[in-house]
Interface confidence: low
């Protein structure tokens, strides 16, 4: 008789990543009978919410409901109706909301309250909206990539061989770059983590992990740019800012009030004799790099070694997955290949930044000018952060893998967050052996 597949016994989960620049909704799916197996959860959908990050709705909270509608409706379509009530929904807000909370706890609470009320209107099992810590963001990103790479399992994986195969169970470090913060997380080699704030202990699938993590608030690519502008306008003698991080011929007017809106620029704030200034691009990688380095205070370190701003960083160890904006920016610049050396990346950045703005606009006609104009800065910032900030070298550069997706799931903190909240990563190794995707009779 012909084999017939039994109805799929699957479960779903939804996580909203409320980042500083935008919100994304992720839908995950896994076989119900294999919840505790490693690598069985996979992403089936990503929906990018149209509009800015939720922190920007502080003066118009009544619009949050409409803002979230499209993606929540998409989730309704993707997940079978019979599963709606048992599908958990989690919203995690990151550095954009951390910054808002620093300015005003009251305003941050107000935004989260409206988000929670909006999400409660859907037929899913809403589990709450909260601002996750930088430490959590780093940790969950690390869990995500190592879960997807199969690093937590001693067993033969049922899924196909993943990229970045290293034939061992040594975990990958995680490098995450957002708009408002950046995280570095990895297992150091036999190294005491000198700063307790940066130490995490996990027991996953029967193995102990001592993990280092740090989140640098204000050092995401967007906030780093605001910092750089605030620093540089201090020494400009009037309202013209010659900026090496923008293409030659690029021009943009910036409101001083916007510049000083974020807590990230407070240290550079001063009374300026103008309300607006004009950025004029001069497109010089070397000068841009120099300017960015001034954001990293490397003169003070109370530990055996530091990243910057007095933050402990152990010696780098093993391979690293660099994701989120690390990946998006380098992908745009066509620099994600494992074969591209650090020297080559620098060379390409020099050429890219020097290209006239008019030429760039023509070459990338389909890209929004707001994003297009910032790739020179972002690419240079990534190099500066990885090389001078985290102390990667030309040699260790080959250990950085720019990762967008692994096995169809986005690299990022959301999957790790859901795995943790749904208790799908057991402390001990499950006894059962993994089965194939579905059972046939």
């Amino acid at each position: 008789t012909q084999n017939k597949a039994l109805p799929e016994n699957v479960k779903y989960g939804i996580v909203l990543d409320a980042g500083s620049s935008h919100t994304s909704l992720y839908i995950y799916k896994w076989p119900a009978e294999k919840e505790n197996d490693t690598g069985v959860v996979h992403q089936v959908e990503e929906c990018r919410v149209k509009g800015p990050g939720i922190s920007k709705f502080v003066q118009k909270v009544n619009e949050i409901g409409i803002y979230l509608t499209d993606c929540m409706e998409r989730a309704r379509e993707v997940i079978p109706r019979s599963q709606h009530q048992e599908t958990p929904v989690y919203l995690g807000a990151t550095a954009g909301m951390r910054l808002l909370r620093m300015e005003s706890e009251e305003l941050a609470d107000r935004v989260l309250d409206v988000v929670e009320r909006s999400l409660s209107n859907y037929p899913f099992d809403f589990q709450g909206a909260r601002i996750i810590t930088g430490q959590e963001e780093g940790a969950y990103g690390w869990i995500t990539i190592n879960y997807l790479l199969g690093k937590f399992s001693q067993k033969t994986r049922w899924f196909s061989i993943v990229p970045y195969e290293t034939n061992n169970q040594e975990t990958f470090g995680a490098l995450d770059l957002g708009g408002a913060s950046t995280q570095v997380t990895f297992v150091p080699q036999n190294q005491t983590i000198e700063s307790p704030d940066n130490a995490l202990q996990f027991r996953l699938y029967g193995k102990d992990y001592n993990v280092y993590t740090h989140s640098f608030l204000c050092y995401g690519k967007d906030q780093a740019l605001w910092q750089k502008l605030a620093k540089d306008i201090q020494v400009a003698s009037n309202e013209i800012l010659r900026d090496p991080c923008f293409h030659p011929g690029y021009k943009k007017v910036v409101n001083v009030s916007d510049l000083y809106k974020t807590p990230c620029t407070k240290r550079f704030e001063m009374t300026l004799p103008f309300q607006q200034f004009e950025i004029q691009g001069i497109g010089n990688y070397q000068q841009c790099h120099q300017s960015i380095l001034e954001l990293f205070n490397t003169s003070y370190c109370p530990y055996s070694q530091c990243a910057f701003n007095g933050i402990f960083l152990p010696p780098l160890q093993g391979d690293f997955g660099a994701f989120s904006a690390f990946y998006f920016v380098m992908k745009f610049l066509n620099l994600t290949s494992e074969k591209v050396s650090q020297e080559k990346v620098t060379e390409m950045m020099k050429k890219f930044c020097a290209q006239p703005w008019e030429e760039i606009k023509t070459s990338y006609a389909g890209v929004k000018e707001k994003y297009l104009s910032e790739y020179c800065f972002s690419g240079t910032y990534i190099l500066s952060l990885l090389l001078q900030g985290y102390h990667f070298t030309a040699d260790s550069w080959e250990h950085i893998h720019f990762i967008g997706k692994i096995q169809g799931s986005d690299a990022g903190w959301t999957l790790g967050y859901m795995l943790n909240l749904t208790n799908m990563i057991p402390a001990e190794q499950p006894l059962s052996t993994p089965l194939s995707h579905s059972t046939y009779v």
């Epitope: 400009a236 009037n238 309202e239 013209i240 010659r242 011929g249 010089n284 000068q287 841009c288």
Partner: antibody, heavy 119, light 109 residues
Framework: EVQLVQSGAEVKKPGATVKISCKVS????????MHWVQQAPGKGLEWMGR????????KYAEKFKNRVTITADTSTNTVYMELSSLRSEDTAVYYC????????????WGQGVMVTVSS | DIVMTQSPDLAVSLGERATINCRTQ??????????MNWYQQKPGQPPKLLIY???SLASGVPDRFSGSGSGTDFTLTISSLQAEDVAVYYC????????FGGGTKVEIK
């Protein structure tokens, strides 16, 4: 080859307004900042102001701020400088000039327009 | 505005070196780029760019012209004065909008 051709000489009475044009050929004015420079007889060069035709943004020197208006017409690739409340000390040659990336060598000047203010 | 002061007029013999100085009230450097230009102007003509970014020779300009300096002190040098170099020379900063120096007249002694 980029060329800047300015309008003809003008004679004006004190208190009047003069409007000078500068037509650019060989490239779009939106690729440049367009500057105006004054030079009184036997005197040095004095920067008056500039326009970014791409965004219609202007900047003026403090000395001329209340009397000068620089405009641009991208459809005809022409920039204009209007100076009001003319006085005898405004008698000068007025030059238009281009600047692409500030400080770099993409520098073209018009031939200049002589404006005489006399009662 | 950035105020600029140029050295007084000078008379130099043909074939001799001519040096013109320009001082700015505040720096015209920005991240390693120096926004100082030098122009030559002859009677009845618009200014002609000689030197840009303090020391780069504009195209078509003879190499007897050179520029040097950074920060607030700058020099234009004509290594061997020729008859056709008789003109007024202006320094100009373009770090913050434009400002010109007062001009230096170069004549033959």
């Amino acid at each position: 080859e980029v060329q800047l051709v300015q309008s003809g000489a003008e004679v004006k009475k004190p208190g009047a307004t003069v409007k000078i044009s500068c037509k650019v050929s060989g490239d779009s004015i939106t690729a440049y900042f367009m500057h105006w420079v004054q030079q009184a007889p036997g005197k040095g060069l004095e920067w008056m102001g500039r326009i970014d035709p791409d965004h219609e943004r202007t900047k003026y020197a403090e000395k001329f701020k209340n009397r000068v208006t620089i405009t641009a017409d991208t459809s005809t690739n022409t920039v204009y400088m209007e100076l009001s409340s003319l006085r005898s000390e405004d008698t000068a040659v007025y030059y238009c000039a281009t600047e692409r990336v500030p400080g770099f060598e993409t520098d073209y000047w018009g031939q200049g327009v002589m404006v005489t203010v006399s009662s | 505005d950035i105020v600029m002061t140029q050295s007084p007029d000078l008379a130099v013999s043909l074939g001799e070196r001519a040096t013109i100085n320009c001082r700015t009230q505040q720096t015209v450097d920005h991240y390693g780029t120096t926004y100082m230009n030098w122009y030559q102007q002859k009677p009845g003509q618009p200014p002609k760019l000689l030197i840009y970014l303090a020391s780069s020779l504009a195209s078509g300009v003879p190499d007897r012209f050179s520029g040097s300096g950074s920060g607030t002190d700058f020099t234009l040098t004509i290594s061997s004065l020729q008859a056709e170099d008789v003109a007024v020379y202006y320094c100009q900063q373009s770090r913050n909008l434009w400002t010109f120096g007062g001009g230096t007249k170069v004549e033959i002694k």
